[in-house]
Structure formats: structure tokens, C-alpha cells
């Protein structure tokens, strides 16, 4: 229901807002940390900016019905069309309790539209408990608050991010369903803008209360690698990022925003076919530890540190990084044991404003995406969109550590 700058992207025939009707695997484990790159010469299943290019292994008889991969934060299992479990992962929304199912009329009738939804449970995404998400018509979900428009480009769950226009057909709907333990979004019979003759797509994303994420594909009428990304990115996977503020050298009284995409999983688009499914199972993260002892003794793929002031366990790579820096947590944790903290009062904390945001591990991470912009009072309220796809090309997995100055 909102402006869609970049004219031409939202054009659909007639009145696009006409009302709609109702409606096993095996393991390949690798301990990884940011900067580590596993063997790049195998067939690529997915790209993981936290751990470099990951390998796709085949079953002994060379069939790839089920593929499992480890991405530091998640283990993904890909189920091919012939795998019975792929059908089991499809949630039949029509069979669900009618009171728990909602056809979203705004999303079902518009293009490049989003709508915020509050979940009935805390969904752990990269270890962060989320209650509010934003469903987009383009086959994906924005995860997290809109602090900065660029942050939304790097915090997503995307079963199939593409230029879908539900306003094209009265049969197209965006439906969601929440039963208290799982939240399912289904893009039902949606068409690609400009590619309507290829047929309709039906797929869904399920967010489980235990943090599992399932992508299930019912109808994929064309080869996903053939979908044009000139008007809209085409992606399948997950991404998370954090934003940090640091003083701008040019304007002393302002602070520069840097958005750091600390982890991304991109699935091979050729694996997205009708009746296939992908299941992401979350791996333990530092954030789940609630005490210093548990934090320091954890045997995770991450280097967990305890910040006594914040009473938080972290690798330093999560959405709370700004606080981690402001309170000098990286320095505090250096060479200290839990016993060292026992006599300290953690209630009198105040941010260390002189603390440099670019400490240690952040600068050594090679797989990163920085998007810088000058702070404005509330630039999510402004119209920053400059037509076309804006800075889409800067979001390529090949982009590593290059600041993009937005000048906002």
C-alpha cells in the first residue's frame, strides 16, 4: 500500500488490488570460524560468508537426494523431489485451523509490498529471539527491526527471493499461519513480474519455535538460475547483519553507520525445484549461554567471551555488537577468567565512548560487507530509493570488505 519508487516495477494488468478469494542425510562437519575457507574446488552447494565456500558432497551412488552441510550457525539439509521427507516438510495450510490462517489482502494484491507481523512466540534467528518480522511479496521475510533501510538487505529468510507480483492474478495470495509453535508464510500461485507466461510459483517458509527454518517448494515452473536478477535480486538462503556507529572523520559531530553482514548462506538456485525442500537446523551460539562458566567452557565453533558488565556471552559477531563495543567487552574479556569477575559490580556500567569500534576480530574478517552512511535523524522515514535496484550489485557474495558510502 505504499510508494514503490523505481517506476515500472509495480505495473500489473488492470486493478492489481482486486479482492482475492479465501483460501535423513549424513554429516559433513567442519569447525569453522570467520575467515576460514574450506576446499573451494568441489561442487558448490551454498555460499557462507562466515565460513567461505562450502562443499557439496554426493551420496555414495552419486545421487544428491539429501545433502547436509554445516554453516557455523546452521546445518542445512537439502531434500530432492524424490525424497519422501520433502513432502513431509510441506505444511498444508488448507488443513490448518481456520482461525490460525490468514490471507493477507494487502500482500496478495500488491507488488514490492511488505507487512509487519508479530509472532506468537520468540523465534531464535542466529541466536537472537525475534517477535516481529516483515513479510515481503517477493518471496522472502525481512528479519528484525528497520533501523536502517540497508540493514533490511542483509537480514532475511529467503525461500525464493525474486520479483514476484501477487497483484498480477486474482489467484495469487500470500497466506500465513501461526499455531504457537510454527509460523508459516506461503506464497501461493505468485507470478514473476514480466515472466508471467512461465507459470505460477507456490512455496513456503516455516519458522519453528526451536529455531529451525524450512523452505518447501510445491510448484517451481522454471529453472531458478534462469530468473533474471536485473530488476530484483534472486536469492535463496539466510543472512544476518549488525549495524555499528562510529565517529565520522568528515563530520565530527555525526556518526557513520557501518552495516556488517557477518553471515550469509546462499543455496545453489539450481537445487530449488518443485517438491524439493531445505531444512536449516540452528547450531548452538554463544548468546544462549547465560553464565560466565557456561560461556567460557563452551565447545562451539565460535570463540565465546563473557562480558561481565552486560552479563552476556558473545563471539562479538551478533546484533548486539554495538553494545559489545560501547562497553569495552572485547577488552574486558582478554585473558580473564570467570573468577576474576566474581567480586565486580556489573550494575554500574556505562559505555566506554573512547573505545574504538574496529577492534581485533572485526578487521581480520575477510568475508564482510560494509555499507556506510552518515546518520540522519530518522532516515527510514525518508524516500532514499533511487530507482532500479539501487545498490543491488554491492550485495554480491564477491563483495568483501568494500565500504559503500550512501551519502544519506
Amino acid at each position: 500500500l505504499s510508494p514503490q519508487p523505481g517506476a515500472g516495477h509495480d505495473e500489473g494488468p488492470g486493478s492489481g488490488w482486486a479482492a482475492k478469494g479465501t483460501v535423513r542425510g549424513w554429516n559433513r562437519r567442519a569447525r569453522e570460524s570467520p575467515g576460514h575457507v574450506s576446499e573451494p574446488d568441489r561442487t558448490q552447494l551454498s555460499q557462507d560468508l562466515g565460513g567461505g565456500t562450502l562443499a557439496m558432497d554426493t551420496l555414495p551412488d552419486n545421487r544428491t537426494r539429501v545433502v547436509e552441510d554445516n554453516h557455523s550457525y546452521y546445518v542445512s539439509r537439502l531434500y530432492g523431489p524424490s525424497e519422501p521427507h520433502s513432502r513431509e516438510l510441506w505444511v498444508d495450510v488448507a488443513e490448518a485451523n481456520r482461525s490460525q490462517v490468514k490471507i493477507h489482502t494487502i500482500l496478495s494484491n500488491t507488488h514490492r509490498q511488505a507487512s509487519r507481523v508479530v509472532l506468537s512466540f520468540d523465534f531464535p534467528f542466529y541466536g537472537h529471539p525475534l517477535r516481529q518480522i516483515t513479510i515481503a511479496t517477493g518471496g522472502f521475510i525481512f528479519m528484525g527491526d528497520v533501523i536502517h533501510r540497508m540493514l533490511t538487505a542483509t537480514q532475511y529468510v529467503a525461500p525464493l527471493m525474486a520479483n514476484f507480483n501477487p497483484g498480477y492474478s486474482d489467484n495469487s495470495t500470500v497466506v500465513y499461519f501461526d499455531n504457537g509453535t510454527v509460523f508459516v508464510v506461503q506464497w501461493d500461485h505468485v507470478y514473476l513480474q514480466g515472466w508471467e507466461d512461465k507459470g505460477s510459483f507456490t512455496f513456503q517458509a516455516a519458522l519453528h519455535h526451536d529455531g529451525r527454518i524450512v523452505f518447501a517448494y510445491k510448484e517451481i515452473p522454471m529453472s531458478v538460475p534462469e530468473i533474471s536478477s536485473s530488476q530484483h535480486p534472486v536469492k535463496t538462503g539466510l543472512s544476518d547483519a549488525f549495524m555499528i556507529l562510529n565517529p565520522s572523520p568528515d563530520v565530527p559531530e555525526s556518526r557513520r553507520r557501518s552495516i556488517f553482514e557477518y553471515h550469509r548462506i546462499e543455496l545453489d538456485p539450481s537445487k530449488v525445484t518443485s517438491m524439493s525442500a531445505v531444512e536449516f537446523t540452528p547450531l548452538p551460539t554463544c548468546l544462549q549461554h547465560r553464565s560466565c562458566d557456561a560461556c567460557m567452557s563452551s565447545d562451539l565453533t565460535f570463540n565465546c567471551s563473557w562480558c561481565h558488565v552486560l552479563q552476556r556471552c558473545s563471539s562479538g559477531f551478533d546484533r548486539y555488537r554495538q553494545e559489545w563495543m560501547d562497553y569495552g567487552c572485547a577488552q574486558e574479556a582478554e585473558g580473564r577468567m570467570c573468577e576474576d569477575f566474581q567480586d565486580e559490580d556489573h550494575d554500574s556500567a556505562s559505555p566506554d565512548t573512547s573505545f574504538s569500534p574496529y577492534d581485533g576480530d572485526l578487521t581480520t574478517t575477510s568475508s564482510s560487507l560494509f555499507i556506510d552512511s552518515l546518520t540522519t535523524e530518522d532516515d527510514t522515514k525518508l524516500n532514499p530509493y533511487a530507482g532500479g535496484d539501487g545498490l543491488q550489485n554491492n550485495l554480491s557474495p564477491k563483495t568483501k570488505g568494500t565500504p559503500v558510502h550512501l551519502g544519506t
Epitope: 505504499s2 492489481g16 479482492a19 514490492r112 511488505a114 533501510r149 524516500n383 530509493y385
Partner: antibody
Framework: QVQLVESGGGVVQPGRSLRLSCAAS????????MHWVRQAPGKGLEWVAV????????YYADSVKGRFTISRDNSKNTLYLQMNSLRAEDTAVYYC????????????????????WGQGTLVTVSS | EIVMTQSPATLSVSPGERATLSCRAS??????LAWYQQKPGQAPRLLIY???TRATGIPARFSGSGSGTEFTLTISSLQSEDFAVYYC?????????FGQGTKVEIK
Amino acid sequence: QVQLVESGGGVVQPGRSLRLSCAASGFIFSDYDMHWVRQAPGKGLEWVAVISHSGSNKYYADSVKGRFTISRDNSKNTLYLQMNSLRAEDTAVYYCARDRSVYLYYGYHYYEGFDVWGQGTLVTVSS
Amino acid sequence: EIVMTQSPATLSVSPGERATLSCRASQSVYNNLAWYQQKPGQAPRLLIYGASTRATGIPARFSGSGSGTEFTLTISSLQSEDFAVYYCQQYNDLPLTFGQGTKVEIK
């Protein structure tokens, strides 16, 4: 400054037509979805219609569907409401309102209320 | 369509007192809710969006709360200029719908 000014109201007989205009200034009109909202004398607010920024998508309240048409001319920064087959119950002050949008990446956005309103124009349908 | 119901229809309050207005949705609208103020002969003015965020230039005495189906607009200390009619509106789904309004009058 940001401003919306409606015009075209007046007294009209039932079954006749009327066209309302809303002139926008102080902002990039073509970047915003626009709405019409009406208020019958002594009554509450009723949403009437919306049009997307480019004019390609339109949606109407059931009470006016098939009789009213929302349109816009971005080159003239003007919003229109063509009202046909008018009825006595269409008597109201008609406001145009700008959609307050929150921008996300890739041109996505979600709606968050009407942040700019015109002063209204009175339409009286009476024989 | 989603029906929005406001209560009370009229609220009589003395200047300086606290006013609490309620809005109920017939189904969940999450936090996709706005509050407007309208004075006689004037157009409505956006006060709150996202159920709890004050619009630009709105004084801190206005606050919104709630999520799902139950929402509240609170005016902590009524000023003379606050006596008006207040409307809630959901923008979670089409058609967009308003409550019938609550008139806040001087006691």
C-alpha cells in the same frame, strides 16, 4: 511546505457525477501512494480508496466499488476521485491523504498511517 | 473486513488529568495501528503509528500501547488543546478501517 488542497466539491443530485481533485505540493508526489477518506456530517472517518504511486494499482471500499474511480496525474501532482451514480449516503467531507511509508531495501515498503491530510471538500448529494 | 471498536464513546476529563482511550480490533492487526486527533472543522492529524510510535511533532504526553487486538492511547496530562475526537485505524489489511471515535471533552 508539504500541502494537499482538495477542490471540486459541491451540491449534486442523486445519480449524477462529480470529480474531486487534490493538488499536492512540497513533496515528490510520484513517490507516494495516495488515499481518499470521507466523513459524513457528525460521523466518523471512512476510508474510500487508495492508488499506488504509479497509478497502476487501485483499491476501493465496498461502499463505493463500481461507482468511484481513483486516478492520478503525476506530471500535474494531482490526485482525482471520479464519483458516479452518487447517493445521499455519499454526502460527506472528502479528504485526500498521503500514505506514510517506511522504506526497506529493494523498493519494498510498508504502510504506516496517513501523515499528511488536505483540508477537505464538502460533497452534498441532495435532490 | 476488520472492525475497529473504540470505547468509551465520550470521555469527560478535567485539564491536567490523565485520559485513557481504548480501541479493539475484531481480529489481530499486530501493531499495524494508528491514532488520529481531529478538532472541529479541521482535518485529522496523525498522532501515533505502529501502535506506539509518536509521529513527528507530537508531544510526549501522548503515548500508545498494545498489540494484536487491544490498544490504548494515553494522554498523561490533558491540555486545553487536547480536547478533540480521537480515532484509531488499522492498516494491517484491506479495506483499511477506522474506529467510530472517542470524544474527549472538558469535565
